[in-house]
């Protein structure tokens, strides 16, 4: 459905508030270093222009594409060359190359200061003084730090952010009301960003076939009563939504997401019995609720898959006539029967089935060749089951902090070339799988754990792509999306790695250590642990535990001392010497 003016169409569909929010997010995700005021100015100019187009769709420039309009606006920024360097060269290109160029320059790890949370009273004053600016600032700060954040979902986060301040700034104890809500939004926001980053990576690095396969598996688990045709329609629409958002087409993405939510709510009977409570909510909340909805109950008496996918005389005919549809049906049927499997496992099973048919349908006796295909699935199923079991046992034995440390050691030994901050960030997040998933019932553990690990490992892949240092990481990240986690799990100690020279400066600590939050202290200690392993990759668990216990004791002692700095200066070199001796 073509419109004379795309910008007028989107403004009318989305309404002014959402239009302005989405344009601010789009600009902030592209120009991550620009000051807030600059972005607000650009957004206001675009909004005024959109209003002229709503009034008269034939007005000058109203027929231009959104990429052309937005790109032209971004290219008016005066300091583009000084601030962004070669990104300024994008402005010499024509659409669609210019937008592709901007996309390629999105920075997953921008050099921005961590967000500092002001005092509650300061925040409440700012909220009351200018609510609109306060909320725009939130969108801007999150979007520039998370350039692939799912834009319509970010509007939902902003709505919750606003609600938290509206409620808590009236409360008797503002801090007790507000801080837990802000912590929850921060943690959920980071998780949402990471999940979306994996969706964009699968689309951009592996193509829409990979994303569609993921979506078929996930939606079939969620909506096991829906027919394959219904799931296919949802997958097609969802792929369009995410392709748009990942491509920077945020207005189209938000509009299409709203249409998808409307469709799902109008067709609940043929999708899922679990959608009712979502569909009564306002738009942003409704879309969020639908995305997070729990799995519907499986239909009773689903027949065995063997009849149609192994025993049927038509397996190879189906495979030859409509390869992707047939594999999609197989994946749908398997996934709706297995909410207890991770999506990644289901995709591996579909890949194994495809590989078997590819081989067997060219054989002299295809049926004889693929007759045992389901037996080949067993080791693929057992591998993540065992991994989850072992790691949950380890988590329960050690607790989160020490479990993270075990993973830090494990991953540093596998890929010691990776930067220490990246190893610390990724291993800490890998370690959070324990608290997140191990408490769940058996049937929910694997989907929780393995699909979460896929999200965390994607972060490693994204950071590593920016600064590649390890062929092993590149190989695991690029060879197969569904086998990334097994690929990393299978890595052993890197024998070719030349240990890092000892640097006393790395292990020198000061009194400021004592004023750090518990989390910051952990990060400091974990940073030291990674550096130790890089120095002595073959150190045993016992040796490393000894050094870390000594470290904790040394820090605790000096933080209790009257003259903390003097204690660190005196005890620090002793700790370093003792550690070197212990690891010799």
């Amino acid at each position: 459905d073509t419109h004379k003016s795309e910008v007028a169409h989107r403004f009318k569909d989305l309404g002014e508030e959402h239009f302005k929010g989405l344009v601010l997010v789009a600009f902030s995700q592209y120009l991550q270093q620009c000051p807030f005021e600059e972005h607000v100015k650009l957004v206001n100019e675009v909004t005024e222009f959109a209003k002229t187009c709503v009034a008269d769709e034939s007005a000058e420039n109203c027929d231009k594409s959104l990429h052309t309009l937005f790109g032209d606006k971004l290219c008016t920024v005066a300091t583009l060359r000084e601030t962004y360097g070669e990104m300024a060269d994008c402005c010499a290109k024509q659409e669609p190359e210019r937008n592709e160029c901007f996309l390629q320059h999105k920075d997953d790890n921008p050099n921005l200061p961590p967000l500092v949370r002001p005092e509650v009273d300061v925040m409440c004053t700012a909220f009351h003084d200018n609510e609109a600016t306060f909320l725009k600032k939130y969108l801007y700060e999150v979007a520039r730090r998370h350039p692939y954040f799912y834009a319509p979902e970010l509007l939902f986060f902003a709505a919750r952010y606003k609600a938290a301040f509206a409620e808590c700034c009236q409360a008797a104890d503002k801090a007790a009301c507000l801080l837990p809500k802000l912590d929850e939004l921060r943690d959920e926001g980071k998780a949402s960003s990471a999940k979306q980053r994996l969706k964009c990576a699968s689309l951009q690095k592996f193509g829409d076939r990979a994303f569609k396969a993921w979506a078929v598996a996930r939606l079939s688990q969620k909506f096991p009563k829906a027919e394959f045709a219904e799931v296919s329609k949802l997958v097609t629409d969802l792929t369009k939504v995410h392709t748009e958002c990942c491509h920077g087409d945020l207005l189209e993405c938000a509009d299409d997401r709203a249409d998808l939510a409307k469709y799902m709510c109008e067709n609940q009977d043929s999708i899922s019995s679990k959608l009712k409570e979502c569909c009564d909510k306002p738009l942003l909340e409704k879309s969020h609720c639908l995305a997070e909805v729990e799995n519907d109950e499986m239909p009773a008496d689903l027949p065995s898959l063997a009849a149609d996918y192994v025993e049927s005389k038509d397996v190879c005919k189906n495979y030859a006539e409509a390869k992707d549809v047939f594999l999609g049906m197989f994946l749908y049927e398997y996934a709706r029967r297995h909410p207890d499997y991770s999506v990644m496992l289901l995709l591996r099973l579909a890949k194994a089935y495809e590989a078997t048919l590819e081989k067997c349908c060219a054989a002299a006796d295809p049926h004889e060749c693929y007759a045992k295909v389901f037996d080949e699935f067993q080791p693929l199923v057992e591998e993540p089951q065992n991994l989850v079991k072992q790691n949950c046992e380890l988590f329960e034995q050690l607790g989160e902090y020490k479990f993270q440390n075990a993973l830090l050691v494990r991953y540093t030994k596998k890929v010691p070339q990776v930067s220490t901050p990246t190893l610390v960030e990724v291993s800490r997040n890998l370690g959070k799988v324990g608290a997140k998933c191990c408490k769940l019932p058996e049937a929910k553990r694997m989907p929780c754990a393995e699909d979460y690990l896929s999200v965390v490992l994607n972060r490693l892949c994204v950071l590593h792509e920016k600064t590649p240092v390890s062929e092993k990481v590149t190989k695991c990240c690029t060879e197969s999306l569904v086998n990334r986690r097994p690929c990393f799990s299978a890595l052993e100690l890197d024998e070719a790695y030349v240990p890092k020279a000892f640097n006393a400066e790395t292990f020198t600590f000061h009194a400021d250590m004592c004023t750090l939050s518990e989390k910051e202290k952990q990060v400091k200690k974990q940073t030291a642990l990674v550096e130790l392993v890089k120095h002595k990759p073959k150190a045993t668990k016992e040796q490393l535990k000894g050094v870390m216990d000594n470290f904790a004791a040394f820090v605790e002692k000096c933080c209790k001392a009257d003259d903390k700095e003097a204690c660190f200066a005196e005890e620090g070199p002793k700790f370093v010497a003792a550690s070197q001796a212990a690891l010799a």
Partner: nanobody, 123 residues
Amino acid sequence: QVQLIESGGGLVQAGGSLGLSCAASGRPVSNYAAAWFRQAPGKEREFVAAINWNKTATYADSVKGRFTISRDNAKSTVALQMNSLKPEDTAVYYCAAVFRVVAPKTQYDYDYWGQGTQVTVSS
């Protein structure tokens, strides 16, 4: 196994309409291709219409524009709406099904068959 039972046949005047229905049981068939075939006395069984998993329909040239095949997966039924009937449409109409992504047009491709229902068009 899939069991198919046709209903709706009968006697109708030329130019009239009739609706046939086929009820499937035994296992879910929403992803199966379903078809209607017919056999006039002393003639070969011939293809009439087929419908696949995503409701894409195909028709024999002789019935195009007059007959419509449809499916209701919630009820596990496949229907054939026949309009502008002609005496040469007189035959026993059979419902058939097979697990195929692309609906075949030849009878030998179908695994499951109903018993048939008689349609007679008088002039």
